[in-house]
Interface confidence: low
């Protein structure tokens, strides 16, 4: 029998340029008579143009919703009712071609063409894009609060805030033809629920979304977004009612930045430079295409790309990359934002060099990407360390901590976290190495103690990049490095002349001169430790709440013992800068470390001195008794202590602690306490120091109070931020 043809609605959005009309400010106001009359004429012209082609039989409806510069640009949408089987045949490209063909056919025609009665339409200025009914609904919901702005070259235009009586607003932005728009969003309130979506076209087309941001993000207080060209739309959706704009928007046109480079690398094994997407740290734009060609000096080397908070992953070929597509040596990889470092190692097999392409495969983009590049030795990629194939990083091997996510760095270890004697592969504890007493059968633990050795997991790296065999040689009063750098920066870790954490005891003045009390409006919130003349280290989670993120709130007290009274050795500081570790993750407590820059340098005294910072290779041996200090609660759920408490805790092997906490313990964490509980940190101790005394009598910072289950509970140890796991970031900031 006869089967009715199934018809579907196909929505198109677009713009066209009118050469014999000029844009005026009146056309930005939808309520003006100029806007109404121009819309009526443009709408008529658009309908006539469509119906002049073979698309006319499918015409359903159309609307001109806005105007812009150039001399006059009309922005519109229209709907065609198409037989389902023909839908793919009427793609936006096909529809555009049909309309352009129609326009070209009448350019020199003397015949009266209805759509040319008033308008001279530029065939080259016609753009047709795919849209949806949902897009049109989204557009219509903003028309009560629709703002058009043209921004000229060299201008930075601050956009007027949204109309708070509306629930949604749209800023339609346009710039000079051959430039691209850069939008800057700055959140101005601590908290909000607003949503902003940026599009690479004049209206809210879902398929052309560049990015959307929610709430007043503290992680990204400022966001810069690049469009692929001179047109952009920003849609605001109201969150909580507020009389204050929770954000400031500004826009400027910028020139296209070439993203192509040819480089020849030097014969050395470290970072040699940086590659980045245009206008980094701005979001990369849709249609970004970068091509970097790197030439390697010899086939002994491979090329390493070190990423920060971004990784490359293989993706099934048919799936698009949502966070950037990379092709390296004809291998397709997808970018992925992560809160970890990552390296991609590229073996070199030909002297022709390596081409790296980065492409934004879809209109959805993300923060600009930056990568450090350098060489590695193909035969020994990680001298003295283990190459973690999961993330391309060199990690310490057999040190008792699973640094590699798959744990292979701790597999097949003859001696874990100990020294392996050459003679018979017996294992001796690290403090026995180079201590002047032979412990191995033929004394191999005491060999090469006065000379440089290949760098490895437990060797100390001197400033001249050479390594020494003696473990933990820092500040022990004996120069072990040729350049003496192991004895530099040693004005630290000494207690003053000394006359409650759970299970603790009261400390005396000057006993823990690095201890800090971090206070808000006179109330102790967290502990911390002085590590340099102007820097205090603490836990990032102390600043988790938005209300705690402002430096002006905080006062740092040093030399303090009693919370309710002052004594002459006590000093207070304001905070000039607060830096959270860029990889800090609230949920997992990973990288739980923050640095506070004091408003002025400390004047050292018996009561105020920094603690020593360990080198990355410093080994804090499980079983070692160390101390935690703070004004935290003396029992779970109790009030904070008036007196500075101290308590000894034992360092716990990582695998044991990891088991207790169901494998939530990362390599940036360290556990301390006792099986039976009792002695532990508690609320209010957060950020405070876990310190261990070296043989030299100096105290080294091993950890920061981070998290744990309750306080002093049996079988649940305290979990601390492992300082050796974050030391490179600390040093980078402090120096």
């Amino acid at each position: 029998g006869y089967k009715a043809e199934v018809m579907v609605s196909q929505v198109y959005s677009g713009s066209l340029r009118v050469l014999n009309r000029h844009f005026s400010q009146d056309l930005t106001r939808r309520e003006s008579s100029a806007f109404r009359s121009e819309t009526a004429k443009a709408q008529k012209m658009l309908k006539e143009l469509i119906t002049s082609t073979r698309l006319g039989t499918y015409y359903n409806s159309s609307s001109v919703y806005s105007f812009g510069e150039g001399p006059l640009t009309c922005f519109f949408w229209f709907i065609l009712q198409i037989p389902e089987h023909r839908r793919l045949m009427l793609s936006p490209e096909v529809v555009q071609a049909l309309l352009v063909e129609e326009l070209l056919s009448t350019v020199n025609s003397s015949a009266a063409v209805p759509y040319r009665a008033e308008y001279e339409v530029d065939p080259e200025g016609l753009v047709i894009l795919e849209a949806s009914v949902k897009d049109i609904a989204a557009l219509n919901s903003t028309l009560g609060c629709y703002r058009y702005s043209y921004v000229g070259q060299g201008q930075v235009l601050r956009l007027k805030g949204p109309d708070h009586l509306a629930s949604s607003c749209l800023w339609h932005l346009q710039g000079p033809k051959d430039l691209m728009l850069k939008l800057r969003l700055e959140w101005t309130l601590a908290e909000c629920r607003d949503r902003l979506a940026m599009y690479d076209v004049a209206g809210p087309l879902e398929k052309r979304l560049i990015t959307s941001v929610y709430g007043c993000s503290r992680q990204e207080p400022v966001v810069e977004v690049l469009a692929s060209g001179a047109i952009m739309a920003v849609v605001w959706k109201k969150g909580l009612h507020s009389y204050y704009d929770p954000f400031v928007l500004s826009v400027q046109p910028v020139v296209f930045q070439a993203c192509e480079v040819n480089l020849t690398l030097d014969n050395r094994l470290d970072s040699q430079g940086v590659l980045s997407t245009p206008y980094f740290p701005s979001y990369y734009s849709p249609q970004t295409h970068c091509s970097w060609h790197l030439t390697v000096p010899s086939l002994d080397y491979g090329l390493a790309l070190w990423f920060d908070a971004y990784a490359l992953r293989r993706q099934k070929y048919d799936l698009p990359c949502t966070q950037g597509q990379w092709t390296i040596q004809n291998r397709r990889l997808c970018g992925l934002r992560i809160l970890q470092p990552y390296a991609e190692r590229i073996p070199v097999v030909a002297t022709a060099g390596i081409t790296i392409n980065f492409t934004s495969q879809i209109s959805l983009t993300g923060p600009g990407v930056r990568v450090h590049y350098g060489l590695y030795n193909q035969s020994d990629p990680c001298p003295g360390e283990f190459l973690c194939s999961v993330n391309g990083l060199c990690v310490p091997a057999c040190d008792g901590v699973k640094d590699c996510p798959n744990g292979l760095d701790e597999r097949n270890c003859v001696c874990r976290a100990t020294f392996q004697c050459k003679e018979d592969s017996t294992c001796i504890s690290l403090p026995k190495v180079c201590d002047g007493q032979p412990d191995c059968l033929n004394g191999s633990d005491e060999e090469q103690c006065q000379e440089g050795v290949p760098c490895g997991t437990f060797t100390f790296q001197c400033e001249d990049r050479s390594c020494v065999k003696k473990p933990n040689p820092q500040c022990d009063g004996r120069p072990d490095c040729r350049d003496g750098s192991d004895e530099e920066h040693c004005d630290c870790g000494l207690q003053g002349p000394s006359s409650r954490i759970v299970g603790g005891a009261v400390s005396s003045e000057g006993e823990w001169p690095w201890q800090a009390s971090l206070q808000v409006r006179g109330r102790h919130i967290c502990g911390g430790a002085l590590i340099a003349d102007r820097w205090v280290i603490t836990a990032a989670h102390c600043f988790q709440e938005d209300s705690m993120a402002s430096t002006v709130l905080w006062t740092v007290f040093l030399g303090k013992v009693w919370q309710n009274s002052r004594w002459p050795g006590e000093v207070s500081f304001k905070v000039s800068r607060l830096l959270l570790h860029p990889y800090h993750e609230e949920d997992s407590h990973d990288y739980d470390v923050a640095l506070l820059q004091l408003d002025h340098p400390v004047v050292r005294s018996a009561a105020v001195r920094p603690v020593c910072l360990p080198a990355r290779s410093h080994f804090f041996e499980p079983g070692l008794h160390c101390w935690i200090t703070g004004w935290g609660a003396l029992r779970e759920g109790g009030p904070i202590s008036n007196a500075l408490q101290k308590v000894d805790v034992q360092l716990i092997p990582q695998d044991l602690c990891s088991e207790v906490y169901r494998y939530q313990v990362t390599p940036r964490m360290l556990c301390a306490g006792y099986r039976k509980g009792k002695k532990d940190a508690c609320q209010g101790d957060s950020g405070g120091p876990l310190v261990c005394k070296a043989l030299s009598g100096r105290w080294f910072l091993a950890g920061l109070v981070s998290w744990g289950l309750g306080c002093g509970r049996p079988n649940y140890f305290g979990v601390y931020t492992r300082i050796t796991g974050v030391i490179s970031w600390i040093q980078q900031v402090v120096t």
């Epitope: 601050r158 101005t188 400031v248 500004s250 206070q519 409006r521 006179g522 402002s550 430096t551 002006v552 006062t555 207070s572 304001k574 000039s576 800068r577 408003d599 002025h600």
Partner: antibody, heavy 118, light 107 residues
Framework: QVQLQQPGAELAKPGASVKMSCKAS????????ITWVKQRPGQDLEWIGN????????YYNEKFKSKATLTVDTSSRTAYMQLSSLTSADSAVYYC???????????WGQGTSVTVSS | DIKMTQSPSSMYASLGERVTITCKAS??????LSWFQQKPGKSPKTLIY???RLVDGVPSRVSGSGSGQDYSLTISSLEYEDVGIYFC?????????FGAGTKLELK
């Protein structure tokens, strides 16, 4: 609304001290710093220091450390600045203002004109 | 200390003219910059904070822009009441430091 009341003028002899006041109203006094600024006739502005009424914590410009002492009385919502060992170089208008790390000084007192003369 | 270099030190402009004053910091001040206007015998009046945010009640012809070390204050169309001395202030770091001021007078 936010207001800061300062006495209009103070006269003092060289070598003496002067203590000026700044009474705040219209906002939570203990939650914002009070900042003090000096302006000599026809000259630019110089920051003297800040005091945080919530804790009494102070921060001084090195240049004014031995010259100015900042204090507060939270019960009367008043901040004070004492200038000691006065010389003619201390003749100036001194302003107080609430200070916030985001807005800096968005309200200012009317200023106290100090004249040091024998 | 962060040094703020303000220019010009003085300028003449006509009513309706566009006026721009600049301040350069000796290091990146992360947009922590305020602009003040002062009239003879009066206390300073804050116009802009965080480099580009207008204080309530300040006319929209006044705007601030810039980032990093370079900042500017623009009056799009000068009016009689805009005459006075303009100062910038960095408050990214203690000690707070001011620019030396720009005296704006009518031509």
């Amino acid at each position: 609304q936010v207001q800061l009341q300062q006495p209009g003028a103070e006269l003092a002899k060289p070598g003496a001290s002067v203590k000026m006041s700044c009474k705040a109203s219209g906002y939570t006094f203990t939650s914002y710093w009070i900042t003090w600024v000096k302006q000599r006739p026809g000259q630019d502005l110089e920051w003297i220091g800040n005091i945080y009424p919530g804790s009494g914590s102070t921060y001084y410009n090195e240049k004014f450390k031995s010259k100015a002492t900042l204090t507060v009385d939270t019960s009367s919502r008043t901040a004070y600045m004492q200038l000691s060992s006065l010389t003619s170089a201390d003749s100036a208008v001194y302003y107080c203002a609430p200070y916030d790390s985001d807005y800096a000084m968005d309200y200012w007192g009317q200023g106290t004109s100090v004249t040091v003369s024998s | 200390d962060i040094k703020m270099t303000q220019s010009p030190s003085s300028m003449y402009a006509s009513l309706g003219e566009r006026v721009t004053i600049t301040c350069k910091a000796s290091q990146d001040i992360n947009n922590y910059l305020s602009w003040f206007q002062q009239k003879p015998g009066k206390s300073p009046k804050t116009l802009i904070y965080r480099a580009n945010r207008l204080v309530d009640g300040v006319p929209s012809r006044v705007s601030g822009s810039g980032s990093g070390q370079d900042y500017s204050l623009t009056i799009s169309s000068l009016e009689y009441e805009d005459v006075g001395i303009y100062f910038c202030l960095q408050y990214d770091e203690f000690p707070l430091t001011f620019g030396a001021g720009t005296k704006l007078e009518l031509k």
